[in-house]
């Protein structure tokens, strides 16, 4: 087929999809034109496995990523629950436009959020001390709408300060008790989430939380002192 005479713009370069926790963000490098005073705009389209291409606009996906001057499209900008369903096979494509001119489409490799996501550490970690125990509470890296499809399990990496690291888990609960610790000792810990997607038997190991340390309480039978 003869080349499209209107397809004379350079295509956006180095598009990247960021899938971090619930975020779904497409970004790219700007198309620079030295001989134009008008801004280059961009259009993003998406498709599912057997669907046609849809323009990424408010009606279709809840965000406007057509005729935009920005060099990113955040599909989850409206809310963390917005964006593409996490178990859908999604393909994105992108082009630059200037008046009647446009670039060729740049098509990204397909993704599934659960398959490709980078899982961050558990958040809001709070620890309550006991005598020879630490109760650890935290929230999930992100919310999963249907926990029969995918779910988190958790591991705690812990060690007596200056000692050998141990791992406890997996747990399904957002509350974990480390028992059989020594009283009046300092223990350090990190919590880690692992995302399991039942459908494809896929699991994504998450980042460790920052190290934090906690003193267990003295034996409860001893008299309390300042």
């Amino acid at each position: 087929a003869p080349p499209d005479p209107l397809s004379q713009l350079p295509a956006p370069q180095h598009p990247k999809i960021r899938l971090y926790n619930a975020e779904q963000v497409l970004s790219w490098e700007p198309v620079a034109l030295s001989n134009s005073t008008r801004p280059v705009v961009y259009q993003v389209q998406f498709k599912y496995t057997d669907s046609k291409w849809f323009t990424a606009d408010i009606m279709s996906i809840g965000v406007n990523c057509t005729q935009i001057t920005a060099t990113e499209c955040d599909f989850t900008a409206a809310s963390p629950s917005a964006g593409f369903p996490m178990d859908f096979n999604v393909t994105l494509r992108l082009r630059a436009e200037l008046g009647a001119l446009h670039s060729a489409w740049v098509t990204m490799p397909w993704f599934q959020h659960y398959r490709n996501v980078t899982v961050g550490p558990p958040e809001n970690i709070e620890v309550t001390p006991g005598e020879g125990s630490l109760i650890i509470r935290f929230s999930s890296p992100f919310d999963i709408a249907d926990t029969s499809t995918a779910f988190f399990c958790y591991y705690v990496h812990y060690w007596e300060k200056g000692g050998i690291q141990q791992v406890k888990g997996p747990f399904r609960s957002n509350s974990i008790s480390l028992d059989n610790l020594k009283p009046s000792r300092v223990y350090c810990l990190q919590v880690q989430a692992q995302l399991l997607w039942n459908k494809s038997n896929i699991f994504r190991v998450g980042h460790l939380s920052n190290i934090s340390c906690y003193e267990t309480m003295a034996d409860a039978s001893t008299e309390l002192q300042q």
Epitope: N124, E126, V127, P129, N210, C213, M217
Partner: nanobody, 123 residues
Framework: QVQLQQFGGGLVQPGGSLTLSCAAS????????MGWYRQAPGKRRELVAS???????TYADSVKGRFTISRDNAKNTVYLQMNALKPEDTAVYYC?????????????????WGQGTLVTVSS
């Protein structure tokens, strides 16, 4: 150094009410949680109530529905409102704060205690 100063306590009749308060001061980077423990003569120390920064409360079964813990984070102060007091609530009540002083390589929470205040429930 971290200091916990307790206020309140005393003698109260069964069914009566008391409020304890506890203010933390000193080199405090973070406190989480703050709470109250008690120790009756010849008994082991027990948790009465605890409150985390995210608002997660823990109560001993024996005080649920009667005691309420609250906290003023800006003042590093924790309160214990005790209603419908019973003779078995008689004990020395200790304020507890889990404090990170910011003086370690990583956040490190250590146990600090108030001086204790006697609550006596008797007719």
């Amino acid at each position: 150094q971290v200091q916990l100063q307790q206020f309140g306590g005393g003698l109260v009749q069964p069914g009566g009410s008391l409020t304890l308060s506890c203010a933390a001061s000193g080199s405090i980077f973070s406190i989480n949680p703050m709470g109250w423990y008690r120790q009756a003569p010849g008994k082991r120390r027990e948790l009465v109530a605890s409150l985390t920064n995210r608002g997660i409360t823990t109560y001993a079964d024996s005080v649920k529905g009667r005691f309420t813990i609250s906290r003023d984070n800006a003042k590093n102060t924790v309160y214990l409102q005790m209603n419908a007091l019973k003779p078995e609530d008689t004990a020395v009540y200790y304020c507890h704060a889990y404090v990170d002083t910011g003086s370690h390589e990583y956040p490190q929470y250590e146990n600090y205690w108030g001086q204790g205040t006697l609550v006596t429930v008797s007719s």
